[in-house]
């Protein structure tokens, strides 16, 4: 039975040209995290593997930095970065937990963080 929950940074906004940290946290489970994938729509941005550490997809190497923790830092943001981001926790023995973050990249300097929320 999957008892864990993923808490994410929820709906967030940031300025064009700036950077943002995407964060997820898995709690309420003793499952072992094998790997965390960060995905944007159908694209794989990065992997944090329990055995082998971080690997950033070559097409994102210039604008994506690992961390802090299991999070992901997006840099040099463009309006095209607006959209859904997913943290996918592969665990044993529970299976897969997925968290969703919506990022809006704003032209203006008004960029406020949204509320945090949980996904069971």
């Amino acid at each position: 039975m999957m008892t864990g929950t993923i808490e994410t940074t929820g709906n967030i906004s940031a300025e064009k040209g700036g950077s943002i940290i995407l964060q997820c946290h898995l709690s309420s489970t003793t499952a072992q995290v094998t790997q965390v994938n960060w995905e944007q729509q159908d694209q794989l941005l990065a992997i944090c593997n329990a055995d082998l550490g971080w690997h950033i997809s070559p097409s994102f190497k210039d604008r994506v930095a690992p961390g802090p923790g299991l999070g992901l830092t997006l840099q040099s943001l463009t309006v095209n970065d607006t959209g859904e981001y997913f943290c996918i926790y592969h665990t044993y023995p529970d299976g897969t937990y997925t968290g969703r973050i919506f990022l809006e990249v704003l032209e203006s300097s008004v960029a406020e963080h949204g509320a945090r929320f949980q996904i069971p």
């Epitope: 072992q32 690997h55 023995p93």
Partner: antibody
């Protein structure tokens, strides 16, 4: 705790066939690539081949691919190595190793081999 | 196949020494190189992955480096528990290939 336990080896005749097995526990076996590696008595390490997490794809060392076959049964958490027409130069300790997690990218490499079994000695001699 | 030329094959050492083992590759493999340690009667243990990254639980006296097609494993201030065989492995392309091994021995 991740564990890989190979079946017992032993003495086999030249020309004979042997099927080794390796049972994995403490991890999601069906989500990982698995490999076989052997080590000769002279301590030379040789990669034999690997198999995709779902068993649909295998790679082999060219010198061994005609005689060795890797397979897996995910329902039993078991990896196999079928060896045929054995020769004296096949005498070695055979290790199964856990490869990378199924959802990965090329930069993580072909086979992680972070976890190894204890090894099983196969001696080919008449 | 990619050839891995590992040297030296044997290295007499003293405790506290700084030790370097090298593998030279016949083709470019990027950073797709791992180092393994093997003690007598034991299975190999991953020490370095990605040419320079320390594996989980490996003491910080171990380090990996790359200079072109030469890859090195360095042990700063050798300890008795480091006496073992060391192997490099390239995983840039199939078939994966190992170096011939280096045996660390007490002088």
């Amino acid at each position: 705790e991740v564990q890989l336990v190979e079946s017992e080896g032993g003495l086999v005749q030249p020309g004979a066939s042997v099927k080794l097995s390796c049972v994995g526990s403490g991890f999601s076996f069906s989500d990982h690539w698995m490999s076989w590696v052997r080590q000769t008595p002279g301590k030379t390490m040789e990669w034999i081949g690997n198999i995709q997490y779902d068993g649909s794809y295998t790679n082999y060392a060219p010198s061994l691919k005609n005689r060795f076959t890797i397979s897996r049964d995910n329902a039993k958490n078991t990896l196999y190595l079928q060896m045929t027409n054995l020769r004296s130069e096949d005498t070695a300790t055979y290790y199964c190793t856990r490869g990378h997690f199924r959802i990965t990218m090329a930069s993580m490499g072909a086979s992680a081999s972070v976890y190894w079994g204890q090894g099983v000695m196969v001696t080919v001699s008449s | 196949d990619i050839q891995m030329t590992q040297s030296p094959s044997s290295l007499p050492t003293s405790l506290g020494d700084r030790v370097t083992i090298t593998c030279r590759t016949s083709q470019d493999i990027g950073n797709s190189l791992r180092w393994f340690q093997q003690k007598p009667g034991k299975s190999p243990r991953l020490m370095i992955h990605g040419a320079t990254n320390l594996a989980n639980g490996v003491p910080s006296r171990f380090s990996g480096s790359r200079a072109g097609s030469d890859y090195s494993l360095t042990i700063n201030s050798l300890e008795s528990e480091d006496m073992a065989m060391y192997y490099c492995l390239q995983h840039n392309e199939y078939p994966l290939t190992f170096g011939s091994g280096t045996k660390l021995e007490i002088k």
